[in-house]
Interface confidence: low
């Protein structure tokens, strides 16, 4: 696919932060602020948690996640998977796009230690028009939200 | 904002290097190397630690440090807060932009021990003519410089 | 250096991904997939770990690795070094252009635990025709490899 | 390959000092602690502790505080114990070990005898 | 102060299993490492981190940990293996490495 950026034309963007209603519990992606502070949207749509592409191209898309706790939840996995993946219509299944492991919250914590650790996610990607990228975090519980400038998910075209 | 890129036009970007100087005990930002080395300016200029914005758009801002230590010097907060802040003439406190909390340098690591971690920001922001962005880490003491490739800070125009 | 980006041309970008064959244990550069799955190559060309460059320019790079263990290798060092290194006809050696350390592996690490820790690198450089950019990870063995999505490497012109 | 080569063997009297060098190849010095034991004839090891040639930094077995002294020159990637008021008592093998985390390489030993 | 404790000696016939034990109360916590040392020379390293083997090392030789125990085992062991055998480990704060006292064992 040969690409080219047309000098009137507006290059796609967009930074989406993360807001209480972020967090669902549901086992979907993380939702994410569109309009309201840091957050905005050019040339991109939004739907239920996903940055949507209207024109398909090459984006770098890029994501990330405050995580914090004291020790860590009752049940919780040694590994937190951070990562962005794709929807598209062509294919009933989420492809993982980029992917972070970390274990901020093993037994060298002592089990009642505040603790913070960050992950950040960025690359390019080849993305269709009509295809959805959404970030998902597991084990949830462990991000940290405050005020967007932490937790935030963004896109754009190269 | 309807942004175009022009063809004709030179991108904005920069690239700006720890050096020596970067770490001033002064409560202030970082400072930054502008010429040396890897460091440059390209259509943005520098202002006591802050890149400042000639020409206003939507710009992908990022910023490294290298934290390290031999355990954790006295009276250090078991969180490291690592952060770009935008000045604007329009409001008299920083706002905060991208930022990162990080526990590196908890009861976990053993008391005379040398360790290292890394801390990487980057998203877009809308940033107007005559802003600035700086970055700022708390505790400064943690940030480890060396030859301006392990704590760094830039931006350019998307 | 004036760069202009011509509206008719494309910008260069790629994005490579970590397989198998990443780990030489030759002590040389990490490898890349260049074609399969989320690799591409577009006005960037590749040869032995390398990004070769064939349009100056102030290029983003960016490298994500996936590090993890049980345990830790015999002989590891205390510190992990992650970075991206450019090649250039005009000097014998490698030039460090943006670098990590990190110790996720020290003996704070309790016995016997799986551990996970991610590395990300980014930031803008300029490249001349010619040059090229290679990632290296000393102690490489505790680079973890899986489907391309948790290690990366790749670069766009900005 | 790796190789740890030791200085030789040094004859001392009661309250003098002895400093032992160790010199590192076949890796990066700065990337490993170098870490000190000895052990008596007959005896076990004792560990009296390590130094990051990196950074410099130290961390000495509370039994040998106030007289030890772990240093290291890069240039030469060379490690150094410096043991001071020697009593009869420390007469032993002094070995140099790399360790990141695990003491994987030994150096050959340095033999030192104090007596009057 | 933390100390880990092995028997003074182990004898064994030739081709026998030989069991040394290392006993230490932050075992659970902590990694165990046994060390082979021949008279005259440098001790070597012959598992690391409970029961990994370097590279080298015979395959009868073998670690495990359980709880408060260390074990190295010699699984047929051979008149060569005579030496004395060290356990350490490292101390609660991983700072400071700890030996044991060290096994004589006899293959006879």
């Known amino acids: 696919l040969i690409q080219e950026r047309r000098s009137h034309e507006v290059n796609p963007a967009a930074h989406l932060t993360g807001a209480n209603s972020s967090l669902t519990g549901s086992g979907g992606p993380l939702l994410w602020e569109t309009q309201l502070g840091l957050a905005f949207l050019r040339g991109l749509s939004y739907h239920d948690g996903a940055l949507v592409v209207t024109k398909a191209g090459y984006y770098y898309i890029y994501s990330k996640v405050q995580l914090g706790g004291v020790g860590c939840p009752l049940g919780l996995a040694s590994t937190i998977t951070h990562g962005l993946y794709k929807r598209t219509p062509r294919y009933p299944e989420e492809l993982e796009l980029l992917v972070s492991q970390q274990s901020p919250c093993g037994r060298a914590t002592s089990s009642s230690r505040v603790w913070w650790d960050s992950s950040f996610l960025g690359g390019v990607v080849h993305l269709e028009a009509g295809e959805e990228v959404v970030v998902r975090v597991l084990d949830e519980r462990l991000v940290r939200l405050r005020d967007g400038t932490r937790s935030y998910f963004g896109a754009f075209m190269v | 904002l309807i942004q175009e890129r022009r063809s004709h036009e030179v991108n904005p970007a920069a690239h700006l290097t720890g050096a020596n100087s970067s770490l001033t005990g002064s409560g202030g930002p970082l400072l930054w190397e502008t010429q040396l080395g890897l460091a440059f300016l390209r259509g943005l200029s520098y202002h006591d630690g802050a890149l400042v914005v000639t020409k206003a758009g939507y710009y992908y801002i990022y910023s490294k440090v290298q934290l390290g230590g031999v355990g954790c010097p006295l009276g250090l907060a078991s969180t490291i807060t690592h952060g770009l802040y935008k000045r604007t003439p329009r409001y008299p406190e920083e706002l905060e932009l991208l930022v990162s909390q990080q526990s590196p340098c908890g009861r976990a690591t053993s008391s005379s021990r040398v360790w290292w971690d890394s801390s990487f920001l980057g998203g877009v922001v809308h940033l107007e003519a005559g802003e600035e962005v700086v970055v700022r880490v708390l505790d400064e003491r943690l940030v480890r410089l060396r030859d301006g490739t392990r704590s760094y800070f830039g931006a350019f125009m998307v | 250096l004036i760069q202009e980006r011509r509206s008719h041309e494309v910008n260069p970008a790629a994005h490579l991904t970590g397989a198998n064959s990443s780990l030489t244990g030759s002590g040389g550069p990490l490898l890349w997939e260049t074609q399969l799955g989320l690799a591409f190559l577009r006005g960037l060309s590749y040869h032995d770990g390398a990004l070769v460059v064939t349009k100056a320019g102030y290029y983003y790079i960016y490298s994500k690795v996936q590090l993890g263990g049980v345990g830790c290798p015999l002989g590891l060092a205390s510190t992990i070094t992650h970075g991206l290194y450019k090649r250039t006809p005009r000097y014998p050696e490698e030039l460090e252009l943006l670098v990590s350390q990190q110790s996720p592996c020290g003996r704070a690490t309790s016995s016997s635990r799986v551990w996970w820790d991610s590395s990300f690198l980014g930031g803008v450089v300029h490249l001349e025709a010619g040059e090229e950019v290679v990632v290296r990870v000393l102690d490489e063995r505790l680079v973890r490899l899986r489907d391309g999505t948790r290690s990366y490497f790749g670069a766009f012109m900005v | 390959q790796v190789l740890l080569v030791q200085s030789g063997a040094e004859v001392k009297k009661p309250g003098a000092s002895v400093k032992v060098s160790c010199k590192a190849s076949g890796y990066t010095f700065t990337h490993f602690d170098i870490n000190w034991v000895r052990q008596a004839t007959g005896q076990g090891l004792e560990w009296m502790g390590w130094?990051?040639?990196?950074?410099?930094?130290?961390d000495y077995a509370q039994e040998f505080q106030g007289r030890v002294t772990m240093t290291r020159d890069t240039s030469i990637s060379t490690a150094y114990m410096e043991l001071s008021s020697l009593r009869s008592e420390d007469t032993a093998v002094y070995y140099c070990?790399?360790?990141?985390?695990?003491?994987?390489?030994w150096g050959q030993g340095t033999l030192v005898t104090v007596s009057s | 102060s933390y100390e880990l404790t092995q028997p003074p000696s182990v004898s064994v016939s030739p081709g026998q299993t030989a069991r040394i034990t290392c006993s230490g109360d932050a075992l659970p916590k902590k990694y165990a490492y046994w060390y082979q040392q021949k008279s005259g020379q440098a001790p070597v390293l012959v598992i690391y981190?409970?029961?990994k083997r370097p590279s080298g090392i015979p395959e009868r030789f073998s670690g495990s940990s359980s709880g408060t125990m260390a074990t190295l085992t010699i699984s047929g062991a051979q008149v060569e293996d005579e030496a004395d055998y060290y356990c350490y480990s490292t101390d609660s704060s991983d700072n400071h490495v700890i030996f044991g006292g060290g096994t004589k064992l006899t293959v006879l």
């Open positions: 070990a790399r360790g990141g985390t695990t003491l994987d390489y």
């Open positions: 130094m990051n040639p990196d950074s410099d930094n130290t």
């Open positions: 981190e409970d029961s």
